[in-house]
Structure formats: C-alpha cells, structure tokens
C-alpha cells in the first residue's frame, strides 16, 4: 500500500494510473466503500462523501490514463485509505494528514517560550525535528518547546515530520518582539542635544501599546519616570513628561526621544519599557548617557565625565597635535598651569575616540573661551 503524507490546509494529489493511455471508467472510494468521485465518459461524477466540496480531478489527464484524486484544504480527518478502481484493478493509497501549529501566538516577546504542537491522525507515530532560523535543532513527539526565545529566533522555523520513512515539511514564521538592541550608550558634550532612538526588531501591520522611560541619574538617589506615552497604530502620543528635563518625542516609529541639553545631572541610565496590546510582558531597552565637561578655573584645566563608563575607558587631556599630558582610567583628569593653545579632552576605548571636547586656553591674563 502506497503511503502519502499531506499537510493540513494544503492540497494533495493521489495518483491512479491505468495501463491504457486513454480515458476509461474509474472510481475513487474511501475505506468505507463510499464513492468520492469518478467519471462517465468525459464528465466527472461525485459521490456522497464528506469530501464532496473539496474533491477534484483533472479531466485533461484522463486521456493519458491518469485519474488523480485531488483533495483541497486537507483536514486531519481526511487521513484514510483511498481506493482507486480502474481496469478491474484496485490501487490503495494511505493518506496521512498532519498539522503543525504554534499553540500560542506566532508573535512572541523576547524571553518567552514557543510551543509547537503536532496534530496527527490516530494510529500514527510520527517524529518531529525543527530547525530554528539560527540553526538550532530541536526534536520531539507531539509537542516541542523552546524556552527563552532570543531575537535570532525570529524568522522561519522549518519542521520535518517523519512517518513510514516518508517526510513532510512545515514552515512556521515566528516573530520575536524585541528592540533591535538590548542596550545602547550615547556620548555627549555638555550642552549638546541628545537623541535617543529605540528601533524595533520587527514590523507588524498595527502596533498598539504604551511605554515609559525610567531614568536613574548617576547623581540621584532614586530613579524617576521621565516620560510616558501611548502607541496607537504606530502613532506615538505623549501622556506625561517631567518638567526637568523636558523630553520631546517623535510622533512616528521608531521611538525617538530628544533631550534638549546634555547636562551632568542627566548622565546615567534609563530603561524604556513598551507594553504591547494583547501581550503579556514588556519589551525593554536600556539606554545610557555619558556627559563630558571641560573647564578651566584659574590655573587648573579639568576634564570630567559623568554617567556609566566602563573601567577600561581612558580619559586624556592633550594639547592639539601633541602627546597626551595626562591619561587615566578615571572619570576626571586635570592639568595645572596649562600652556596656552587648543586643548582636547578625549574619552577613548582602545584608541578609538568616543567623545571629544575642545577648550581654548588663553595666556594667563585672559579668561578661557569655550568653542
């Protein structure tokens, strides 16, 4: 007996061939001997089976001695033995229909679990193997679970169902809802405008929810909510914003916040949370602000940074086109009695400059000018 595997919702073609390459009489029946379809001359006749409105054949193939039974929109319960009667012969085909579904939404938050459930006909004992978009293989029986979904799990999961040495492949598109970056850091000179961007790692037709940015300033003892907002069909509207700082927010995605001025008292870290409609849990993105200030007071030239810096970052003070006068893994450096000229304060990571502030030191009888 020939075995054919089908996928729920798909179309399957069961073949039946006669030795004579011409249109002769044929009938397809199910295991209960109920007629599904057949022919009378060049016309198609249908029986009283449950498949009536989903069964088809192709008359153009009859003249070639091929009498297919085409079943559209397959259901698990279509799994059966189908018998083709042609030329006093009986051809039996066993059809097994499988379905594979994500038993939750296919749009899942980062860190959530994905469960795939296999629907199979009674009496079958299939095995399933799924491959994630990042190449991770998982195996199982009727259910497969993946905990702690990551951003790289977004995309097409390819699952192979094996039964009777035959296989059928399912493709399931999974969208992991997350921000593109888990964390970002912005380096700014004092007084500069600060732009925070929170791009999403997914696109959906309609996006509705609400969000908030909590900020922990380095100088503050506790965190405070800087802004709350709503998201409706990808349109952003601010609900509440603090007076200091007075953040501005873009009306369209990606989520975009503007801080008018980078000041030492704002340096620190923030956590933007986004709660999406009909989803349990929230999306998070951490954002950090490092602020630099270079000042000259009397005979002391000082460079300071505020905010979450890594201990391996180097802070230097140097006169333009000269070697660094001072270079330390500290958050403040200074030079006493600096020479006149354009001084540079540099925050760097392994030689790569992250932030630079210039200050002009005038001869001692003048006051300093900050460009």
């Amino acid at each position: 007996k020939k075995v054919v595997l089908g996928k729920k919702g798909d179309t399957v073609e069961l073949t039946c061939t006669a030795s004579q390459k011409k249109s002769i009489q044929f009938h397809w029946k199910n295991s209960n001997q109920i007629k599904i379809l057949g022919n009378q001359g060049s016309f198609l006749t249908k029986g009283p089976s449950k498949l009536n409105d989903r069964a088809d054949s192709r008359r153009s193939l009859w003249d070639q001695g091929n009498f297919p039974l085409i079943i559209k929109n397959l259901k698990i319960e279509d799994s059966d033995t189908y018998i083709c009667e042609v030329e006093d012969q009986k051809e039996e085909v066993q059809l097994l229909v499988f379905g594979l579904t994500a038993n939750s939404d296919t749009h899942l938050l980062q860190g959530q679990s994905l469960t795939l459930t296999l629907e199979s006909p009674p009496g079958s004992s299939p095995s399933v193997q799924c491959r994630s978009p990042r190449g991770k293989n998982i195996q199982g029986g009727k259910t497969l679970s993946v905990s702690q979904l990551e951003l790289q799990d977004s995309g097409t999961w390819t699952c192979t169902v094996l039964q009777n040495q035959k296989k059928v492949e399912f493709k399931i598109d999974i969208v992991v809802l997350a921000f593109q970056k888990a964390s970002s850091i912005v380096y700014k000179k004092e007084g500069e405008q600060v732009e925070f961007s929170f791009p999403l790692a997914f696109t959906v037709e309609k996006l509705t929810g609400s969000g908030e940015l909590w900020w922990q300033a380095e100088r503050a003892s506790s965190s405070k909510s800087w802004i709350t907002f709503d998201l409706k069909n990808k349109e952003v509207s601010v609900k509440r914003v603090t007076q200091d700082p007075k953040l501005q927010m873009g009306k369209k995605l990606p989520l975009h916040l503007t801080l008018p001025q980078a000041l030492p008292q704002y340096a620190g870290s923030g956590n933007l949370t986004l709660a999406l409609e009909a989803k349990t849990g929230k999306l998070h993105q951490e954002v950090n602000l490092v602020v630099m200030r270079a000042t000259q007071l009397q005979k002391n030239l000082t460079c300071e940074v505020w905010g979450p810096t890594s201990p391996k970052l180097m802070l230097s003070l140097k006169l333009e086109n000269k070697e660094a006068k001072v270079s330390k893994r500290e958050k403040a450096v200074w030079v006493l009695n600096p020479e006149a000229g354009m001084w540079q304060c540099l925050l760097s990571d392994s030689g790569q400059v992250l932030l630079e502030s210039n200050i002009k030191v005038l001869p001692t009888w003048s006051t300093p000018v900050q460009p």
């Epitope: 016309f43 249908k46 009283p48 054949s57």
Partner: antibody
Framework: QVQLVQSGAEVKKPGASVKVSCKAS????????ISWVRQAPGQGLEWMGT????????MFAQKFQGRVTMTRDTSTSTVYMELSSLRSEDTAVYYC???????????????WGQGTLVTVSS | DIQMTQSPSSLSASVGDRVTITCRAS??????LNWYQQKPGKAPKLLIY???NLESGVPSRFSGSGSGTDFTLTISSLQPEDFATYYC?????????FGQGTKVEIK
C-alpha cells in the same frame, strides 16, 4: 424551453445574510447541476459553487467555503444560494446557470438566470 | 486553482474586422475551455465549448481553437451585435475559473 427564473433584487446590511432562489422550468430538474456565478459592478465573472439537484451534493470555490450554502427543493424545482456575513465587496449580480451535460459536472453553462442584484450597504 | 489570463483586456474594432482574443491557462487543461459572450445588463451566453465546438444557434463567424495552455476565440467578420465582453472559462478542474474578460468596443 428551459428557463431559470431568479428572485428579485435585495438590499442588505453588512453582516447580514441573503438567500437567492432560482426556479427551473422546461427540463428535468434533477438531471442537471446548477452553478452560481457572481459579477461585481464593472468586474468579471466569478464561480461560487455548484449543487447537484439529484443528490443535493455541493462544492464551493475556496473563497466562499464556510459562508455559502446551496440547497434545493425538488418539489418546486428550485435551488437556493445563501451567502452569510455579507460585506460591501459582496455587492454583485448573482446568476444561477445550468450545466449543459445531463447527470454530470461538465461546467459548460448553456442556460442562465436573469441575475439578482444584491446590494450590501450600511 | 487554475488561473486564466485573457488578452487584450479591451480592443477597438470596426464592423467587418477580424478579431482575435487569446486566453492562457496557468497549467495545461487539454481542451476543457469554453467561451462566453456578455452584453451589458444581460446574462452571459455560451458560444464555444470544449475549445472549438460551436454551441447550437451561435453564428459560424465565431470559432475557437487551442489546446493545453493557449486558446483563441476568433470573430471572422465583426458584426454590430458582436460588441460585447468575452470570457474564457476552464472546466478541466471542477473548481471552475474564468478569465478577467475582453471588452470589444466600436472604433
């Protein structure tokens, strides 16, 4: 002379159902399959489904499955097509058409009803 | 389902012209193809069945040809009453499909 006479025009609200009838005369009613074909304003022909008046067996285009019902009343030689969950896109002229081949599903329609305009509007 | 594509979607011709309309199937349908004529406000009328057979009562100026995927409806000498929309229809599959139609207009 074979004739297919359809029920009159209907105006329906979105979400409602409509039932159109098609009465056959001048031929052996149960010998010929009846199909329903619709035509939206300014658009082409779209096959909806077919009923075998002899067995009552039906088949439908995938697009309409779950929303369309076709029945027959052999005592009055009438077939019915009911379309549920109506939306504005269902505004069309609905035709019944008889298969030219006796006892079979040949798909060549030699006799047609005059058409029934169904308007779906809120 | 089998897709049917007609060309052109419309054409302008004069009385006496020879007019050709083509229909292409997305897969081979042998000769399981019909042609219909429809005039505004009227039900369609069967002209040709099984690709080349003229329905009774249809004038002989109408002819059909083709097999497999490519089919043609020809009107040898266009008459005033032939200005209408023409549709092809496949019946190879029991899930019938029509072409989008070709409108024949007066030049």
């Amino acid at each position: 002379q074979v004739q297919l006479v359809q029920s009159g025009a209907e105006v329906k609200k979105p979400g409602a159902s409509v039932k159109v009838s098609c009465k056959a005369s001048g031929g052996t009613f149960s010998s010929y399959a009846i199909s329903w074909v619709r035509q939206a304003p300014g658009q082409g022909l779209e096959w909806m489904g077919t009923i075998d008046p002899n067995s009552g067996g039906t088949m439908f285009a995938q697009k309409f499955q779950g929303r369309v019902t076709m029945t027959r009343d052999t005592s009055t030689s009438t077939v019915y097509m009911e379309l549920s969950s109506l939306r504005s896109e269902d505004t069309a002229v609905y035709y019944c058409a008889r298969d030219s081949a006796e006892w079979e599903l040949g798909g060549s329609f030699d006799y047609w009803g005059q058409g029934t305009l169904v308007t779906v509007s809120s | 389902d089998i897709q049917m594509t007609q060309s052109p979607s419309s054409l302008s011709a004069s009385v006496g012209d020879r007019v050709t309309i083509t229909c292409r199937a997305s897969e081979s349908i042998s000769t399981y193809l019909n042609w219909y004529q429809q005039k505004p406000g009227k039900a369609p009328k069967l002209l040709i069945y099984k690709a080349s057979n003229l329905e009774s009562g249809v004038p002989s100026r109408f002819s059909g040809s083709g097999s497999g995927t490519d089919f043609t409806l020809t009107i040898s000498s266009l008459q005033p009453e032939d200005f209408a929309t023409y549709y092809c229809q496949q019946t190879d599959s029991t899930f019938i499909t029509f072409g989008q139609g070709t409108k024949v207009e007066i030049k």
